[in-house]
Interface confidence: low
Amino acid sequence: SPGQGTQSENSCTRFPGNLPHMLRDLRDAFSRVKTFFQMKDQLDNILLKESLLEDFKGYLGCQALSEMIQFYLEEVMPQAENHDPDIKEHVNSLGENLKTLRLRLRRCHRFLPCENKSKAVEQVKNAFSKLQEKGVYKAMSEFDIFINYIEAYMTMKIRN
Amino acid sequence: SPGQGTQSENSCTRFPGNLPHMLRDLRDAFSRVKTFFQMKDQLDNILLKESLLEDFKGYLGCQALSEMIQFYLEEVMPQAENHDPDIKEHVNSLGENLKTLRLRLRRCHRFLPCENKSKAVEQVKNAFSKLQEKGVYKAMSEFDIFINYIEAYMTMKIRN
């Protein structure tokens, strides 16, 4: 409905500003159970490997993130709550914070780009066609911008 | 074939180091025709808008980049070559440099992530299952890493 659309847009506007607070809430909630679990974790191998971060930053990022949130909420935390009555409440609180994050993500398509279709290239081609012969001069004269964009893309890929 | 696999891996290993040189070659080639086209471009509006850069950095980045390279090679440059015999050779040279870049991209799947399927979340779940009860301690003790990964994802989305 239009109402939902507006809500979505508002969430998008507010979201970046809320991000540090939401992450701080997650970290605060985790700090209450961190020692308990890290003391019990005697394994030297790593579960959340760099490959997961790479996927988060890659083209399947939002799907990977959504799936990982679901994994923690539906598989890990229910089991974690049963380990000690003292930490059940804190694990539950951590889960609520994670659910809040997921709710915000769902409301804002900018943070779930896998549900969107890109239009930028299409817009370039349409504008180029409308300019007719002048479009060639325009596209060629802006080739240095294109190189800059390629560089930005490649740099991102190297860093990620 | 194994040969192609090796070639792909070698390209991946060498590519980041080659990137500045390849971009320099592109810029050098463009510098020979830049003045010609920029003098002829009398239009004040911009063709390659910021939205294109955003798409390059987004989840459809490699598709957008591939399409833009194709657009320049198949639509813009063939027309540009016909504008003046003096610059035909230089435009051709620019096109060759762009083709080289595309070839390198195609050889290295890291730079064409849209052609890959992610396995990271699946690997996490498999490892978690194998660890049985210890998996809960491991997954919960690494929740701070998960928050870092969420933060990296969100920060990338905000920046892009």
Epitope: P20, L23, R27, S31, D44, N45, I46, L48, K49, E50, L53, R159 | E9, C12, T13, P16, R110, D144, I145, N148, Y149, E151, A152, T155
Partner: antibody
Framework: EVQLVESGGGLVRPGGSLRLSCTAS????????MAWVRQSPDKGLEWVAS????????YYRDSVRGRFTISRNNAKTTLYLQMDSLRSEDTATFYC????????????WGQGVMVTVSS | DIQMTQSPSLLSASVGDRVTLNCKTS??????LAWYQQKLREPPKLLIF???PLQAGIPSRFSGSGSGTDFTLTITSLQPEDVATYFC????????FGPGTKLELK
């Protein structure tokens, strides 16, 4: 117990080459990304190069790119740093380190190996 | 590159003192910061990661705090074996290290 043991350091003339090795034990080597970090009195601690756990990708600081090559042999649980065209400013103690990924801290360091570049 | 500064560069304190070391970064790194202790002729040893969690086996007198650009390492009751140089390390964008704070006994 996690152990990282470097070897291959020494005195070399400017323009010369050295190959550092780092033998890892006490953990699953192929589960970790590895890096070389160097330390000198004038420049302090400087990250030099990193390599992903499966050796697919390598990363270098600008001042060594093209001169240094990081590699690894997971079967031998060994990390390498081939250093060519050495300069006096490369003089430092080189540490082998392990890390979970490129947005994650360096958790264990070897004892270090001294590299001196001097004529 | 992200630049890092540490203060003070030299700190003299007595056994039992509460000691505070500071680290500042040139841009927001959220909580992607680690602290290392380096004793003479030894490699750096990880104390703190992600700004505050304590590495396994590190005494609880060490603690870390901060986020964004300003971080603190605190030693609640200084012990003779804590004499060392302390480095901060950001891993938010690439890897850079602070110049270090040398901690000595009065």
């Amino acid at each position: 117990e996690v152990q990282l043991v470097e070897s291959g350091g020494g005195l070399v003339r400017p323009g010369g080459s050295l190959r550092l090795s780092c033998t890892a034990s006490g953990f699953t080597f192929s589960d970790y990304h590895m890096a070389w970090v160097r330390q000198s009195p004038d420049k302090g601690l400087e990250w030099v190069a990193s390599i992903t756990l499966d050796a697919t990708y390598t990363y270098y600081r600008d001042s060594v790119r093209g001169r240094f090559t990081i590699s690894r042999n997971n079967a031998k649980t060994t990390l390498y740093l081939q250093m060519d065209s050495l300069r006096s400013e490369d003089t430092a103690t080189f540490y082998c380190t392990r890390h979970r990924g490129f947005s994650v801290w360096l958790d264990y360091w070897g004892q270090g190996v001294m590299v001196t570049v001097s004529s | 590159d992200i630049q890092m500064t540490q203060s003070p560069s030299l700190l003299s304190a007595s056994v039992g003192d509460r000691v505070t070391l500071n680290c500042k970064t040139s841009q927001n790194i959220f909580e992607n910061l680690a602290w290392y202790q380096q004793k003479l002729r030894e490699p750096p040893k990880l104390l703190i990661f992600n700004a505050s969690p304590l590495q396994a086996g590190i005494p609880s007198r060490f603690s870390g705090s901060g986020s964004g650009t300003d971080f603190t390492l605190t030693i609640t009751s200084l012990q003779p074996e804590d004499v060392a140089t302390y480095f901060c390390h950001q891993y938010y964008s690439g890897y850079t290290f602070g110049p270090g704070t040398k901690l000595e006994l009065k």
